[in-house]
């Protein structure tokens, strides 16, 4: 009984299409199979940056495969050709491994590349991320931001960029459409005439990095002797009801401090015929319902009762 | 006449650990991959895991992996998935599904009955 | 990972009547498709795998087309066994293997 073999695909490679870390992964069939023409090949493809522990994998019968990489790091790729036993009349085959890596030749020594990015998606609304300046750079350095999302025909440039003492430190982003539950990419890079600027790569959710607006109309309602209702409105926004957490810090007589993480927006206090001040905030924030990440509010404006006995009439300021 | 009996469903709290098997007879075990599918009450079918026919790849849903392990003795005829460190949200209906062609995974010609994993204190 | 949207989520009709059920893929899965039948309590049974080829036993009544990203379920004419919940699953790249989240054929 001959052993019957398989090649590796062939022209294994990882294109870079200029989408920021959105990498292409692409092959040839592997030579000589035309053995197994009444076959469906599939092909095992392991991928990872530089560094990281774990393998991703995946099996597929395409030629392709497209997926997310951080390209401050190097990527390693390997895949080999798959056969059922279908396929060889026997037991199932497979190729040795084909193997490529891919990496951007750094520019620059690492403390060049920006310090403390930090991005924010204002009330689901607007992007604006900022940064500081490299690392003993010169004042000629300036850094440009470039960002692609899927849906984009092509990475573009920062249009409008936050700037401080003539450098650029941060960008303002326009309206991004389609932009939310997908990775977003962001290349800061940077020149100046006297040294090379090392680039940075980032990727991240939108949703992820949401800061919504404080809660509004904030309210008093006596349910009972000894119950308050606290009642607040949904920031004006993008934002559906379903998607905030609420934190609400509550004050009596200058003394008591209740904290509480609500869903609604409403909040039930126990009280004594005794109080003679109420005072309440709240801030909110994207729940894990919508993202896996946020960002709390700022808190509300203060709202206060005091004066008159709180169990005499319904309060609302 | 292909057939697959599951078994090893109960009852079990959040944390603990169950194993499930897959008793399979009527075809050439050893030939084909074989995967595991669920289905919690009312609601559609998920993936969990794949195994290949010599058991050399494994493969699993992002909401299982590290925490269950697909294994197969085809000596046995037998599939198995071994589930640790259950939550709420793996209570369903599991079955065990032969694949008609593939390494992996592919069209699933013949499901086993299912068991039901219960995860609650 | 390829999602899977099956429309629509309930279907009424009534005996005889052709019946179409639509799965689209959020990115092209060429033909490697399959259809499942289930019935409540029931393990799903395989009607149509490779987006168009008739699983073995299963009533000819039943046919599947497309390829890409579109696909259709169609049944000729409908008949008193056929009301069940209908899953479409690709199986182009995985994991994850994913399903549609089921069209519930009911009577009218």
């Known amino acids: 009984d001959t052993e019957i073999k398989v090649n590796p695909p062939q022209d294994f490679e990882i294109v870079d299409p200029g989408y920021l870390g959105y990498l292409y992964l692409q092959w040839q069939p592997p030579l000589s199979l035309d053995h197994f023409k009444e076959c469906t090949v599939e092909y095992e493809l392991k991928y990872r940056n530089i560094g990281s522990e774990t393998w991703k994998t995946i099996i597929t019968k395409n030629l392709h495969y497209k997926d997310g990489f951080d390209l401050n790091k190097g990527i390693e790729a390997k895949i080999h050709t798959l056969l059922p036993w279908q396929c060889t009349n026997g037991s199932e085959v497979q190729s040795s491994w084909a193997e490529t890596t891919y990496w951007i030749s750094p520019q620059g020594i690492p403390e060049t590349k920006v310090q403390d990015m930090d991005c924010v998606y204002y009330n689901w609304q607007y992007l604006l991320c900022s940064w500081k300046p490299g690392i003993g750079v010169l004042l000629d350095t300036n850094y440009n931001l470039f960002y692609w999302y899927e849906g984009l025909d092509h990475a573009l440039q920062c249009v409008d960029y936050i700037k401080a003492d003539g450098q650029n430190i941060g960008c303002r982003f326009p309206y991004l459409e389609a932009s939310d539950y997908k990775d977003f990419y962001i290349c800061v890079n940077g020149s100046s005439e006297n040294k090379p600027i090392r680039s940075s790569y980032f990727t991240f959710q939108l949703q992820n990095i949401v800061k919504p607006l404080p809660p509004v109309y904030l309210t008093f309602t006596r349910e009972s002797s000894c119950e308050i209702k606290l009642k607040w409105s949904i920031p004006l926004g993008p934002i559906p009801a379903r998607c905030f957490d609420y934190e609400i810090e509550i004050r009596e007589d200058d003394t008591t401090l209740v904290t509480a993480t609500v869903e609604n927006e409403t909040y039930t206090l126990k009280t004594t015929n005794e109080t003679r001040q109420l005072c309440f905030v709240v801030r909110s924030k994207v729940n894990i319902y919508c993202s896996d990440d946020g960002i709390w509010s700022e808190w509300s404006d203060k709202q206060c009762w005091e004066g008159e006995d709180l169990s005499k009439k319904t309060l609302l300021r | 006449e292909v057939q697959l009996l599951e078994s090893g469903g109960g009852l079990v709290q959040p944390g603990g650990s169950l194993r499930l098997s897959c008793a399979a007879s009527?075809?050439?075990?050893?030939?084909?991959?074989m995967n595991w599918v669920r289905q919690a009450p009312g609601k559609g079918l998920e993936w969990v895991s794949a195994i290949s026919a010599s058991g050399g790849g494994t493969y699993y849903a992002d909401s299982v992996k590290g925490r269950f392990t697909i294994s197969r003795d085809n000596s046995k005829n037998t599939l198995y998935l071994q589930m640790n460190s259950l939550r709420a949200e793996d209570t369903a209906v599991y079955y065990c599904?032969?694949?008609?062609?593939?390494w992996g995974a592919g069209a699933f010609d013949y499901w086993g009955q299912g068991t039901l994993v219960t995860v609650s204190s | 990972d390829i999602q899977m949207t099956q429309s629509p989520s309930t279907l009424s009709a009534s005996v005889g009547d052709r019946v179409t059920i639509t799965c689209r893929a959020s990115q092209s899965i060429s033909s490697w498709l399959a259809w499942y039948q289930q019935k409540p309590g029931k393990a799903p049974k395989l009607l149509i795998y490779d987006a168009s080829s008739l699983e073995s036993g299963v009533p000819s009544r039943f046919s599947g087309s497309g390829s890409g990203t579109e696909f259709t379920l169609t049944i000729s004419s409908l008949q008193p066994d056929d009301f069940a919940t209908y899953y479409c699953?690709?199986?182009?790249?995985?994991?994850?293997?994913?399903f549609g989240q089921g069209t519930k054929v009911e009577i009218k």
């Open positions: 009527g075809f050439t075990f050893s030939r084909y991959a």
């Open positions: 699953q690709q199986y182009d790249t995985y994991p994850p293997i994913t």
């Open positions: 599904a032969k694949v008609r062609y593939g």
